[in-house]
């Protein structure tokens, strides 16, 4: 992965934090829940994009090259993004215009933008379906899918905002 | 792992009621959705009835729409099945069966050891 100009961190920080809340919003569960405590082996289910030790996110990875763990963060989003726009979400029970939801992906597509490089080219993946007989999993699905993207934004955030704190770039006073 | 028991099964005429029970124990905080399957002889297992566990929205298969309702109760950690208007069509080992989170697919992983239920004409 080359070097490359580095984001705005400080937008990135605050729209992963309003990410974060939104995911929230869209989906709360009752009761206890440990976002980050998931188990070694349910780590590569489906292919889900998880933000790991090799992916360069921790301090001294994002200080030597940060593109490692950005590359690995636009991953996530677009994986996300992806299933926000499949018939999971969009299929019955509909979601209402201005709902949690739809703020959500306006913000995902938001944070995607500011991290997609000019020249970056767009991965394809398949568009999830649900058959006739598999109709009645579609808020399950999107519960458990809104749960994992809470993990992955909980630990984004935390990229960002050591981002923001350590790697902005010092302004410049001008004579 | 999710532990499941089921209990309530027994024999009863056509038109009769009964109420199933799933006593759910262990990783209980990662339970996405608790479900009921059911197995007649000779047939594949089907889908009967789910129920979110953090939401509580439910999803019936269209044949015992209007005549089974699954309910819970979280501070049990238990769901159950009201079963109304029987048909002999209805006779099976029910199963209670959990999808926990991880991934981002329905996935009933752990299942009970079913409970008997037969109609008679």
């Known amino acids: 992965v080359p070097r490359s100009s580095s984001p705005d961190w400080a937008q990135c920080q605050q729209l992963s934090r309003n990410l974060c809340m939104l995911a929230w919003n869209a989906h709360a569960p009752a009761g206890h829940m440990n976002l980050l405590r998931e188990e070694e082996d349910e780590e590569t289910k489906n292919n889900v994009p998880r933000i790991q030790c090799e992916d360069g996110c921790d301090p001294q990875g994002l200080k030597d090259n940060s593109q490692f763990c950005l590359q690995r963060i636009r991953q996530g989003l677009a994986f996300y993004k992806h299933l926000l726009d499949s018939d999971i979400f969009k299929g019955e029970p509909a979601l209402l215009p201005d709902s949690p939801m739809e703020q959500l992906h306006t913000s995902l597509l938001g944070l995607s933008q500011l991290l997609q490089p000019e020249d970056h080219p767009r991965e394809t993946q398949q568009m999830p379906s649900l058959s006739s007989s598999q109709q009645w999993q579609r808020p399950l699905l999107r519960s458990k899918i809104l749960r994992s993207l809470q993990a992955f934004l909980a630990i984004a955030a935390r990229v960002f905002a050591h981002g923001a704190a350590t790697l902005t770039e010092p302004l410049v006073p001008t004579a | 792992e999710v532990q499941l028991v089921e209990s309530g099964g027994g024999l009863v005429q056509a038109g009769g009621s009964l109420r199933l029970s799933c006593a759910a124990s262990g990783r209980t905080f990662s339970i996405n959705a608790l479900g009921w399957f059911r197995q007649a002889p000779g047939k594949e297992r089907e889908f009967v009835a789910a129920?979110?566990?953090?939401?509580?929205?439910?999803y019936y298969a269209d044949s015992v729409k209007g005549r089974f309702t699954i309910s819970k109760d979280n501070a049990k950690n238990t769901v159950y099945l009201q079963m109304n208007s029987l048909k002999p069509d209805d006779t099976a080992v029910y199963y209670c069966?959990?999808?926990?989170?991880?991934?981002?697919?329905?996935?009933?992983?752990?299942w009970g050891q079913g409970t008997r239920v037969t109609v008679s004409s």
């Open positions: 069966a959990a999808d926990e989170y991880g991934g981002i697919s329905v996935d009933f992983g752990s």
């Open positions: 129920v979110n566990w953090s939401g509580g929205n439910t």
